[in-house]
Amino acid sequence: LVPHLGDREKRDSVCPQGKYIHPQNNSICCTKCHKGTYLYNDCPGPGQDTDCRECESGSFTASENHLRHCLSCSKCRKEMGQVEISSCTVDRDTVCGCRKNQYRHYWSENLFQCFNCSLCLNGTVHLSCQEKQNTVCTCHAGFFLRENECVSCSNCKKSLECTKLCLPQIENVKGTEDSGTT
């Protein structure tokens, strides 16, 4: 099966790489604009230059194109703890990231929030904190993992999943409760 091509891709595939079909005259292939520029006017004829203009401040194009407008620069989301790693230039969008000792959690494909890396108190670091993943902790005996923190088994209620890890402690607590009722 031949994959379905959009109209724009169909038109572009007729011309050699780096060129696109003139929208009003499909016998003309115009040279695409370089990254950092956008299409102001199509080339008037074969072998003639495409009129490309540089992107204005606050906009960019990251690859060769025949876009009528540059793309707006992204803004880092302060409310999500994001910081600017590198500013937007005419040929590259803003790069946003997190501070040192933080990791990115992606709520969706294009939205991330910065959180502090876990320190594994009352446990040991199994896997170090990565750019897109929190530290993986292994808890010491008498502690269980809850929301990536090692919590004392004294906080383990029978209904929770921690019961298997904290079974001896829970039995002890139950024992003391029982002895207290006599």
Epitope: M80, H105, Q113, E147
Partner: nanobody, 119 residues
Framework: EVQLLESGGGLIQPGGSLRLSCAAS????????MVWVRQAPGKGLEWVSH????????YYADSVKGRFTISRDNSKNTLYLQMNSLRAEDTAVYYC????????????RGQGTLVTVSG
Amino acid sequence: EVQLLESGGGLIQPGGSLRLSCAASGFTFGNEVMVWVRQAPGKGLEWVSHIDRVGQDTYYADSVKGRFTISRDNSKNTLYLQMNSLRAEDTAVYYCALLPKRGPWFDYRGQGTLVTVSG
């Protein structure tokens, strides 16, 4: 004690509109970034939209961009979600929540309001 109470859900035909509200109490509403998330039947939580403390900066998931509008009234401690041009795929339980701080889970989230888009 933090309380979030959503209202405004219901059964609506495709193309229709609804306005969800979330009444907040037990914390300083104006100090918190507020979030709408939703859960479609048999699916996980989806981030729909959020709004900064003063109502200036907003974010929308691609699936709702141009159709939904988030807003807040700090004097009334209330968060809103105006939903227009509703589609069958918008059917879900909608929750309002405080932006998580400690990690990627919702410490404070309402009970939710069901939106059913069917015609």
